[in-house]
């Protein structure tokens, strides 16, 4: 026999109390799928989060960021502090990069700066606590019909994909 | 979606090279760092190093330096890990892994890994 | 540089909790990092900055990092999560950046 609830289409709830018929979700709440005897309390992005998609019947409130935090956690469950270009985040607040480290994002710890030798390139542009070495080209970029060097990346919002 | 596709597999004789694919799709190549990692049988995940595709700046562990080599074509989005003078221990797969966007997160997405057989 | 110590293996029952350690000098002053890895397939980042989870990562795995061990939490273990488990740092002041403990097998008994 099939389930009278199955016919319950999303943004509806399967009503116990009124003879199993589809009821639509009450304001504030949601059902993502069909089916469903209870409706899903909406999220509410408070604080440092803000609303990046509202909710509906059908689907839940999506929040990001303030400026001034990043997101963290599946569907940015957790809110944290940027720090400035040059600097990482530890559990006790933004700190410089130590010399010979360098970060260029908001969010991160600092990197080390590029070793050039290592594949026997030579330092055109030295490195700061913002910005990597700049290293000259390779042997093999020297040799003919290599490709030039790369220009500079598009600018991206950095974190995990998808959030 | 984000997908890395590594080169097959490769058998070689010791103090021959190898170099490993891997082609990215799903992203902006020239983003995000790409680092390389790899497992020795029955042993556990050992980090060799990253590349900036961007710049081609590069960071290698000091256990390879000076036998890797880490370059990327970003005509076609493709990151290379070159490792030479092999040693029947150097027998492992190896895989390449996306750095999210920033220093110090974990690696988010993996090629599917290419096992390099070292062998006389 | 830097070491991470696991446990070679950890067992549980199907329905327990699993707790999987990683322990470094002052680990907790750094963000740790959880990985996943089955037979023959590539290494799943579970958890993330010592305890975020991934989009698509059940809420019964979570994590923690304090003193000097950071900890992988399994709850409501199933037969699917049996794996071996990397936990990972970036140590910038070394020469090594990228440190990988030496991974634990998660076993589920019976």
């Known amino acids: 026999l099939q389930d009278p609830c199955s016919n319950c289409p999303a943004g509806t709830f399967c009503d116990n109390n009124r003879n199993q018929i589809c009821s639509p979700c009450p304001p504030n709440s949601f059902s993502s799928a069909g089916g469903q005897r209870t409706c899903d309390i909406c999220r509410q992005c408070k604080g440092v989060f803000r609303t990046r998609k509202e909710c509906s019947s059908t689907s839940n409130a999506e929040c990001d960021c303030t400026p001034g935090f990043h997101c963290l956690g599946a569907g940015c469950s957790m809110c944290e502090q940027d720090c400035k270009q040059g600097q990482e985040l530890t559990k006790k607040g933004c700190k410089d990069c130590c010399f010979g480290t360098f970060n260029d994002q908001k969010r991160g710890i600092c990197r080390p700066w590029t070793n050039c030798s290592l594949d026997g390139r030579s330092v055109l542009k030295t490195g700061t606590t913002e910005k990597d070495v700049v290293c000259g080209p390779s042997p093999a970029d020297l040799s003919p019909g290599a490709s030039s060097v790369t220009p500079p990346a598009p600018a991206r919002e950095p974190g995990h994909s998808p959030q | 979606q984000v997908q890395l596709v590594q080169s097959g597999a490769e058998v070689k004789k010791p103090g021959a090279s190898v170099k490993v694919s891997c082609k990215a799709s799903?992203?902006?190549?020239?983003?995000?760092?790409m680092h390389w990692v790899r497992q020795a049988p029955g042993q556990g995940l050992e980090w060799m190093g990253w590349?900036?595709?961007?710049?081609?700046?590069?960071n290698y562990a000091q256990k390879f330096q000076g036998r890797v080599t880490m370059t990327r074509d970003t005509s076609i989005s493709t990151a290379y890990m070159e490792l030479s003078r092999l040693r029947s221990d150097d027998t492992a797969v190896y895989y390449c892994?996306?750095?999210?966007?920033?220093?110090?997160?974990?690696?988010?997405?993996w090629g599917q890994g290419t096992l390099v057989t070292v062998s006389s | 540089s830097y070491v991470l110590t696991q446990p070679p293996s950890v067992s549980v029952a199907p329905g327990e909790t699993a707790r999987i350690t990683c322990g470094g000098d002052?680990?907790?002053?750094?963000?740790v990092h959880w990985y996943q890895k089955k037979p023959d397939q590539a290494p799943v980042l579970v958890v993330y900055?010592?305890?975020y989870r991934p989009s698509g990562i059940p809420e019964r795995i979570s994590g923690s990092n304090s003193g000097n061990t950071a900890t992988l939490t399994l709850s409501r273990v199933e037969a699917g999560d049996e794996a071996d488990y990397y936990c990972q740092v970036w140590d910038s002041s070394s020469d090594h950046p990228g440190v990988f403990g030496g991974g634990t097998q998660l076993i589920i008994l019976g």
């Open positions: 590349i900036n595709p961007n710049s081609g700046g590069t």
């Open positions: 892994a996306r750095e999210p966007g920033y220093y110090g997160s974990g690696l988010d997405y």
């Open positions: 002052d680990i907790g002053d750094k963000r």
């Open positions: 900055e010592d305890r």
């Open positions: 799903g992203y902006t190549f020239t983003g995000y760092y």
